[in-house]
């Protein structure tokens, strides 16, 4: 139930990015909603959906964009250290989870072309791994001033400040509970058969269980599709297919926070789908 | 063209330390390559030894980290591998090798045999 | 580490017959690169990052695969091709290589 309480940073850098198109980007995280982009071509942090209504402090924004705006310099500097002809793609998952005794556990591990191979040594206080690439991005890194240091802090102090502050001043976004709107729907497929298809539409947060019954019995899962909307919802939809003219003999059970019972959700008259 | 050729004694006594020289030709220490060795005993598989990436920073196989140093001349576009204390179990073909791109092996010597023997 | 399993150790065919290399890894990968190797010869890299031809490469080799399952093709073998086969990885350290397949003739 607590899975907001975690405040993660996607970082991405690029090589060689496409003309018109950022080198570097950020998406932050607290828990599944996204509450923060950034990228290199704007170069400032902002609020991603509920969040731009949220009661910060005036220099919150700042403050985001100030630390987004050294780890942009620190990932393309990587690219330097690196050297050969790449194309390289640097990912970072940089953040912090508070526990049970609301003590903070950071993350700081990185990726390059997509395969894990470096991370943030908290007891050390320098970026390490085995590789020869984190060797060099490291080295690089270390010699940037006071980059560690500033790693440190952003991961043992700034980032589970900012989480508790996310966490009293936009309670009411972490709390959003946003019941799905539901259709059943089938069409044919093969000959003999039709595909029912169960849809969610607009719900949060994004755990949710679609099954469907015939005749009141459990008839499976179904296949199942998953993803965000663009305004911080999320939709799904789960298709089973049966014999042709047995429709009716089903129908969709949908779980979700938002609802105070499981809903029950019947096939739509062929008129009112078209 | 970059080409590497290992270079060394062909009979290493057992207890003794094994030196390997590879010579880079065609390339500079300058840019983002790692240099690696690579060994494989008579009739079986290949087993990874270590690097020295361009920055001048090494690391080693765990099995056989507290035996190995590699180390680089840049003046000379060499380097080398250091196998101290070796038994029969160290007699090999011993190959250098070029990673590119933090990928794969692209470029690699001939290969040079050394046998461990009293 | 992670160990590379590849099968069959040897695989006895005649020119122009199709022939498939299994690679298994003890732990799921991102990525499996392939070697030839003949007798008396360094390796050579064939396959890179999985699926990718590298240079000079003839068009006969494929590979293909994914998580811990990794098969190597040569689409109908020429002469030249018949040599020891090894797959190798680097998503978890230290680097491993398999054990070799022998691509014989029969």
């Known amino acids: 139930a607590e899975s907001h309480l975690s405040l993660l940073y996607h970082l991405t850098a690029v090589s060689s990015p496409a003309p018109g198109t950022p080198a570097f980007w950020v998406s932050g995280w607290l828990g599944p909603q996204q509450y923060l982009s950034y990228n290199s071509l704007r170069g400032e942090a902002e609020p991603c959906g509920a969040w731009v209504w949220e009661n910060q402090v005036s220099w919150y924004w700042e403050k985001e964009t100030t630390d987004l705006r050294i780890k942009e310099k620190l990932f393309l500097e990587a690219f330097k250290a690196l050297g050969g002809k790449g194309p390289y793609t640097l990912q970072g998952l940089l953040g912090c989870e508070l526990g049970p005794d609301n003590t903070s556990v950071p993350t700081a591990k990185f990726a390059l072309n997509g395969e894990e191979f470096m991370n943030f040594d908290l007891k050390q206080g320098t970026w390490g791994g085995d590789w020869p690439e984190a060797l060099a991005i490291s080295q690089r890194w270390q010699q940037q001033d006071k980059a560690a240091n500033k790693e440190l802090t952003f991961l043992l102090f700034s980032c589970p400040h900012r989480l508790r502050e996310h966490l009293e001043r936009g309670r009411g976004n972490l709390e959003w509970k946003e019941p799905p709107s539901m259709r059943l729907k089938a069409r044919p497929s093969s000959p003999g058969f039709s595909v029912l298809t169960c849809s969610a539409f607009s719900f949060y947060p994004p755990e949710l269980q679609l099954r469907f019954l015939r005749n009141g019995l459990a008839a499976g899962t179904g296949q199942g599709d998953f993803g965000p909307n663009s305004d911080g919802s999320f939709h799904a939809s789960s298709s089973l297919t049966v014999k042709s003219g047995d429709e009716h003999h089903y129908c969709c059970i949908v779980q979700h926070a938002g609802l105070a019972q499981p809903l029950r959700v019947e096939l739509e008259s062929p008129a009112k789908s078209s | 063209q970059v080409q590497l050729q290992e270079s060394g004694p062909g009979l290493v006594k057992p207890s003794e330390t094994l030196s390997l020289t590879c010579t880079v030709t065609?390339?500079?220490?300058?840019?983002?390559?790692?240099w690696h060795w690579i060994r494989q005993p008579p009739g079986k598989g290949l087993e990874w030894i270590g690097y020295?990436?361009?920055?001048?920073?090494?690391n080693y196989n765990p099995s056989l980290k507290s035996r190995v140093t590699i180390s680089r001349d840049t003046s000379k576009n060499q380097f080398s591998l250091k196998l101290s204390s070796v038994t029969a179990a160290d007699t090999a073909v011993y190959y250098c090798?070029?990673?590119?791109?933090?990928?794969?092996?692209?470029?690699w010597g001939q290969g040079t045999l050394v046998t461990v023997s009293s | 580490e992670i160990v590379l399993t590849q099968s069959p150790a040897t695989l006895s065919l005649s020119p122009g017959e199709r022939a498939t290399l299994s690679c298994s890894a003890s732990?799921?990968?991102?990525?499996m690169h392939w070697f030839q190797q003949k007798p008396g010869q360094s390796p050579r890299l064939l396959i890179y990052?999985?699926?990718n031809l590298a240079s000079g490469i003839p068009a006969r080799f494929s590979g293909s695969g994914s998580g811990t399952d990794f098969t190597l093709t040569i689409s109908s073998l020429e002469p030249e091709d018949f040599a020891v086969y090894y797959c190798?990885?680097?998503?978890?350290?230290?680097?491993?290589f398999g054990q070799g397949t022998k691509v014989e003739i029969k």
């Open positions: 990052s999985t699926s």
């Open positions: 090798a070029r990673e590119e791109n933090y990928r794969y092996f692209d470029v």
């Open positions: 020295i990436h361009d920055s001048g920073g090494t």
């Open positions: 732990s799921s990968v991102s990525y």
């Open positions: 190798q990885q680097r998503s978890s350290y230290p680097p491993t």
């Open positions: 065609g390339y500079s220490f300058t840019s983002g390559y790692s």
